[in-house]
Interface confidence: low
């Protein structure tokens, strides 16, 4: 960047998409400003339009494909430029060598079900969404529930250390009303983050039978 | 333990097809990759291709209009099935699985079966 | 396609002695393999991801390498090391190996 400090990330979901946030300090609001990939090995290049996500920072989505087509492996290098219009011309305000399974995040996780509930257990299943072929099975998964009277930021992370796309959740309350999330995370790349948080799974413990202990 | 039985080979007349079975022990085919290597008599090893554990494949691109590589996980089996043979393809092929991850290389090979091309 | 070349092709060297082949890629590659390779059987994983010993393999044998300059060594060659060796690169579709280099006792 130029003027003020910038910062430029970007991610891969392993498929078809790269999401990136450009941040600049004095930045002007109203200038126009794209992402450009050009691959290194590929015939095609993309650009999206960076649109505002607050003060000083932008976004956008490259699409490279459809959805599940897998338009990049470990080995390709996108080269990534933000480029912002200033009269006529385009100027290059970053610039990155982007290596798209060093810098992983995938998509949430999507089709969360309750498969069981009792009082005091429930088994929930999920599935990974857009994930590439590449990772095989080795992806990882957190998970967490919020309890009642308690916040996300204050429930316990629960870790699946391997592509399990279920969970049995233990010791619940009975007749309660509890909400559930997972992330994945692929375990290659350097750069890679967990996935957005899955839409929250509502779900309620069974009441315990009368005259039973609890 | 890990195994790669590979079955099928024998004489092929030019212009035939030849189709390959790996079976597998000691892991399942809908957890890890498998590949196909072969090797021409006195000659080094070509890649042919892959068929990653959901199913997908990558071929050489040399093979891509002949070739055929499918699995019955059933049966935990992967299928080679290769058409218009010509002489050259007379080799030894070989079915193979990486580490534990993709990028450990092929660390368990099967004993590779002989595909003769002849008429 | 990326081009692996092997060098030399052959060598004979006495038993004690420290062997080296070379493997150099057409292009740069990231992940790089050799294998081991007796007459009539299926090859063997030698050196994984340039430098890692694959699991039960004796530590004379080592790699190192980057770019598109790979070098292999057998620290002190042993009988048993009879053999022809392969490297490979996992850096692109198709999969490459080199030539090979066949290794004899003098």
């Known amino acids: 960047a130029v003027n003020g400090t910038s910062r430029f990330t970007c991610f891969y979901n392993s498929r078809a998409n790269i999401s990136c946030v450009w941040s600049q300090d004095g930045a002007l609001q109203d200038t126009s400003c794209q992402v450009h990939a050009w691959p290194d090995r590929r015939r095609w290049n993309q650009t999206c339009e960076l649109l505002p996500v607050s003060q000083a920072s932008w976004a956008c989505n490259l699409i490279l494909g459809t959805p599940d087509s897998q338009k990049l492996t470990a080995v390709d290098i996108v080269t990534l430029r933000v480029m912002c219009r200033e009269g006529v011309r385009w100027r290059m305000m970053a610039i990155q060598d982007f290596k798209p399974f060093e810098n992983l995040r995938l998509m949430a996780p999507i089709s969360l079900q309750v498969v069981h509930v009792e009082t005091h257990r429930c088994n929930i299943s999920w599935k990974i969404s857009q994930a590439s072929h590449y990772f095989e099975r080795h992806l990882e998964f957190e998970a967490r529930t919020l309890s009642p009277g308690h916040t996300w930021e204050e429930a316990p992370l629960m870790t699946l250390k391997q592509k399990q796309e279920w969970i049995c959740l233990e010791t619940l309350t009975p007749d309660t009303q509890y909400e559930f999330q997972v992330r994945v995370k692929p375990l290659q790349g350097e750069f890679t983050t967990w996935s957005p948080w899955s839409q929250p799974l509502a779900f309620r413990t069974k009441p315990a039978a009368l005259g039973k202990d609890t | 333990e890990v195994q790669l039985l590979e079955s099928g080979g024998g004489l092929v007349q030019p212009g035939g097809s030849l189709r390959l079975s790996c079976a597998a022990s000691g892991f399942t085919v809908t957890s890890y990759a498998v590949h196909w290597v072969r090797q021409a008599p006195g000659k080094g090893l070509e890649w042919l291709g892959v068929?990653?554990?959901?199913?997908?494949?990558d071929y050489n691109a040399a093979f891509i209009s002949r070739l055929t590589i499918s699995k019955d996980n059933s049966k935990n089996t992967v299928y080679f099935q290769m058409n218009s043979l010509r002489a050259e393809d007379t080799a030894v092929y070989y079915c193979a699985r990486a580490g534990d991850y993709n990028y450990d290389g092929f660390a368990y090979w099967g004993q590779g079966t002989l595909v003769t091309v002849s008429s | 396609d990326i081009q692996m070349t092997q060098s030399p092709s052959s060598l004979s060297a006495s038993v004690g002695d420290r062997v080296t082949i070379t493997c150099q890629a057409s292009?740069?590659?990231?992940?790089l393999y050799w294998y081991q390779q007796r007459p009539g059987k299926a090859p063997r994983l030698l050196i994984y991801?340039?430098?890692n010993l694959a699991s039960g393999v004796p530590s004379r044998f080592s790699g190192s390498g980057s770019g598109t300059s790979y070098t292999f060594t057998i620290s002190s060659l042993q009988p048993e090391d009879i053999a022809t060796y392969y490297c490979?690169?996992?850096?692109?579709?198709?999969?490459?190996f080199g030539q090979g280099t066949k290794v004899e006792i003098k």
């Open positions: 991801d340039t430098s």
């Open positions: 068929i990653w554990s959901g199913g997908s494949t």
């Open positions: 490979q690169q996992w850096s692109t579709y198709p999969l490459t």
């Open positions: 292009q740069s590659v990231s992940f």
